[in-house]
């Protein structure tokens, strides 16, 4: 059913004919009783409803109700009359020395272990054990030896099986032996791909669950967007850029008649687009539903370019960060083109993708040089690391996801797809193939998904971003498809702007303001930086034409 | 199992407007990914698209119609409507409509209603 | 708009090989479907997407292709079979329908 807060405002004596009178007197539309969902927010309208059949793969609750068998005893209530967590559920009884616990918890006796009938519910009496091959006697049973499982179970917390020399214990389901003889519940959580989104870990199970903003789906059990209208893909092919609807697969042409554009990125809030023209050597923006009239499509940065080959948006602090592999610097401007500094200018060789997460304060790069690497920052130019240098050759596209923290990449000469969580650990190799990776240049990842551009295979692929299966094609025959980036709202989740929350206008920087990394609660919120010709003061904000070299931000 | 049914005016006279309901069971309109999309065919002729509406309410019109067309949907009652202003002859047709299936399905009808015919006479 | 163009009618004995073709006037990449209709019943999605079997379909359907030639083929063909075979393209927009093709048994 719908929102319940829609089915009738308040309280209400009386109710329309056809609608439901809850418990409560609040009024629902009378098709949402016994849909299953609590629109009374008493639950009345799920009360005496007829008894349903469950699905084998369903728990029936106490009242009728069926639920995921998963959700049965995870620590939560999905039974409106919460019997999923009952003890006479629940319980794992310890059964009594001379008995013989079922994988089920329940108790048989010890003597009916291996005796070729199947006393368990779930048959576990008779797993494990020795059978002798039928002859010219008959099925046999073996001649019986001791049985150390008849004595207290041999010891063990849940099954014991007994061998031909000894015993074994064993766990049901969800479980883990500790010390060869205890049962103790698995973190499926230390998993990392245990779950779309969020994983949390019950005693012999785990729930996934969604971020806000997602929500799950019961089939894939994958976390996809519950919000706003569908998301789109946007890629260039050096002349255009263009858009598919992934939902709706529609194709369109946003921006026609281009030079050499290789790099875009978005402004999702503002409905922005920002790419950057190789030939024309200029960073260019316009809003998306207009970007096709070449009047107004505005010229943010014009001086200074070689080769932009890669731009990112900071959606939060409203900056543009792009790359140029030409001047070989990595440089920011605020989103209007009006103030600019570089913040690397040093160490460079090939840097080409780039892209930004304002909510920590990080940036992070490709450099596809002799030394390739992946490197990340803080936006503002400070605590430059290196996140991989080894068995990487041609990184060409960058990607984060926001949600799991981990960065996606992939490599044009190892033809692999490969991920590495914020601080360079868990690092894994996600694809390789030189079919589907042929020459991959852009990189993005949705929900569950993780899309990339093949230049060689002139397509966009997708895939399972946690295990590199489900590979599929989106588009082909698509002509030099280079960088893409998904358009949704949720890629860009809102964020205080650290230089809006200072008592002074633009945190008292005469310049720029940007955003230093999160590290610890001690972190700066920002640091003021300064144009390319002038030095930051003293005062760490105002600028001035002479001073130390050392205090420049561009010598980073 | 999935099912659409078209019903209309049968017959109407020029320039009035044609409304068109599609009553749909199997699946919602408040799903993810699903879409209604509306199709004619003239008598011995070929298919014609003429709108369809999305889940979340995205409306798309061929450009041709677009101005005369309009497109909306009623979830909790599991229908979707067509207009069509200023009825000519030329509309005459059997109209059709059919779910549509984005992401993976890539917009194909995966079902469709039986059509109900349309006369424009005066 | 994108024109699709189909050969209007095709004759072929029970248990032979058919191929109906579809020629777009701009590409469609993969995003070519293919229909069956008879005359009083619902129209049946047959293929998605050049290749896919839609749910339901007998697997002596097939479809191939890729950016402006495409085909449908039925091997064997049966006697009910007798239909006539639209293919449409979302791709582009409008979507928009070939002209369809009558396959009609000897």
């Known amino acids: 059913a719908a929102d319940p807060l829609l089915g009738g405002q308040g309280p209400a004596k009386e109710c329309e004919k056809d609608q439901f009178q809850c418990r409560n007197e609040r009024c629902i539309p009378s098709v949402w009783r016994c849909d299953e969902d609590d629109d009374c927010l008493d639950h009345s309208d799920e009360d005496d409803c007829p008894k349903k059949t469950c699905a084998d793969s369903d728990f029936t609750c106490d009242n009728g109700h069926c639920i995921h068998e998963r959700w049965k005893c995870d620590g939560e209530e999905e039974c409106p009359d919460g019997s999923d967590e009952s003890e006479a559920t629940c319980t794992l009884g310890t059964c009594h020395g001379n008995e013989f616990q079922c994988g089920d918890g329940t108790c048989v006796l010890a003597i009916k272990r291996c005796n070729q009938e199947q006393d368990c519910p779930d048959g576990s009496d008779e797993a494990g054990c020795l059978q002798v091959p039928p002859t010219f006697l008959g099925n046999r049973r073996r001649p019986r030896g001791l049985n150390e499982c008849l004595h207290n179970n041999g010891g063990c917390s849940h099954i014991c099986t007994d061998l031909k020399i000894g015993f074994e214990c064993t766990c049901p389901a969800g479980f883990q032996l500790l010390d060869q003889k205890t049962c103790g519940d698995i973190d499926e959580c230390k998993d990392p791909d245990a779950c779309s989104q969020i994983c949390v870990n019950y005693k012999g199970y785990f729930k996934c669950e969604c971020y806000p903003g997602y929500e799950m789906d019961l089939l894939t059990k994958n976390c996809k967007a519950a919000a706003g209208k569908s998301p789109s893909l946007i890629f260039t092919n050096r002349h255009e850029v263009r858009r598919i609807d992934l939902v709706k697969r529609n194709y369109s042409r946003l921006i026609p008649m281009l030079k050499n554009v290789v790099a875009l990125d978005m402004e999702v809030a503002t409905n922005r687009i920002y790419w950057c023209d190789l030939s024309y050597r200029k960073i260019y923006s316009a809003y998306m539903d207009k970007a096709s009239d070449p009047k107004e499509q505005e010229v943010l940065i014009d001086e200074q370019l070689h080769s932009p080959e890669g731009l990112a948006v900071d959606w939060v602090h409203k900056h543009i960060y792009w790359t140029d592999s030409g001047n070989k610097t990595i440089s920011v401007a605020t989103v209007d083109g009006g103030r600019r500094c570089t913040l690397f200018s040093r160490n460079l060789s090939e840097p080409r993708a780039i892209a930004v997460d304002p909510l920590q304060g990080f940036m992070y790069w490709s450099d596809w040089g002799n030394q390739a690497k992946i490197e990340k920052s803080g936006l503002n130019g400070v605590d430059r690391q290196t996140l991989v240098s080894d068995n990487i050759e041609w990184p060409n596209g960058i990607t984060l996801d926001l949600l799991s923290q981990r960065l996606y990449w992939v490599d044009s000469k190892l033809h692999q797809l490969s991920s590495i969580d914020f601080s360079g650990g868990n690092r894994k190799m996600l694809i390789s193939s030189t079919d589907f990776l042929s020459h991959p240049f852009g990189i993005a990842v949705f929900e569950d998904k993780v899309f990339w551009t093949d230049l060689e295979n002139e397509a966009i692929f997708s895939a399972n971003r946690l295990n590199g299966l489900e590979i599929s094609i989106l588009a082909e025959n698509l002509n030099n498809p280079h960088d893409i980036v998904i358009f949704h709202e949720l890629k860009q989740p809102r964020a205080a702007d650290a230089c809006k929350l200072s008592v002074q206008p633009n945190g008292g920087c005469e310049y720029l303001c940007l955003p230093a990394p999160q590290i610890s609660s001690h972190s700066p919120k920002y640091t003021c930086a300064c144009p390319d010709t002038m030095w930051l003061g003293p005062d760490m904000k105002r600028c001035y034409r002479d001073g130390n070299e050392d205090s420049k931000m561009g010598s980073t | 199992q999935v099912t659409l049914k078209e019903s209309g005016p049968g017959i109407l006279q020029p320039s009035q407007t044609l409304s068109l309901t599609c009553t749909f069971s199997?699946?919602?309109?408040?799903?993810?990914?699903?879409?209604v999309g509306w199709v004619r065919q003239p008598s011995g002729k070929g298919l014609e698209w003429l709108a369809n509406?999305?889940?979340?309410?995205?409306?798309f019109y061929n450009p041709s119609l677009k101005n005369r067309l309009t497109v909306s949907k009623d979830t909790s009652n599991n229908q979707a409507f067509l207009r069509i202003t200023n009825g000519d002859t030329a509309d005459t047709a059997t109209y059709f409509c059919?779910?549509?299936?984005?992401?993976?399905?890539?917009?194909?009808?995966?079902?469709w209603g039986q059509g109900t015919s349309v006369t424009v006479s005066s | 708009d994108t024109v699709l163009t189909q050969s209007p009618a095709l004759a072929v004995s029970p248990g032979e090989r058919v191929s109906i073709s579809c020629r777009a006037s701009?590409?469609?990449?993969?995003?070519m479907h293919w229909y069956q209709q008879n005359p009083g019943q619902q129209s049946k999605l047959l293929i998605y997407?050049?290749?896919n079997l839609a749910s339901g379909v007998p697997a002596r359907f097939g479809g191939s292709g890729s950016g402006t030639d495409f085909t449908l083929t039925i091997d064997p063909v049966e006697a009910d079979d007798t239909a006539t075979y639209f293919c449409?393209?979302?791709?582009?927009?409008?979507?928009?329908f070939g002209g369809g093709t009558k396959l009609e048994l000897k």
């Open positions: 997407r050049t290749s």
């Open positions: 509406i999305w889940w979340d309410d995205d409306k």
């Open positions: 449409q393209q979302s791709w582009n927009d409008p979507p928009t």
């Open positions: 059919a779910r549509i299936l984005g992401e993976d399905i890539g917009g194909a009808l995966d079902a």
């Open positions: 701009e590409g469609v990449n993969s995003y």
């Open positions: 199997g699946f919602s309109l408040n799903t993810y990914g699903m879409g």
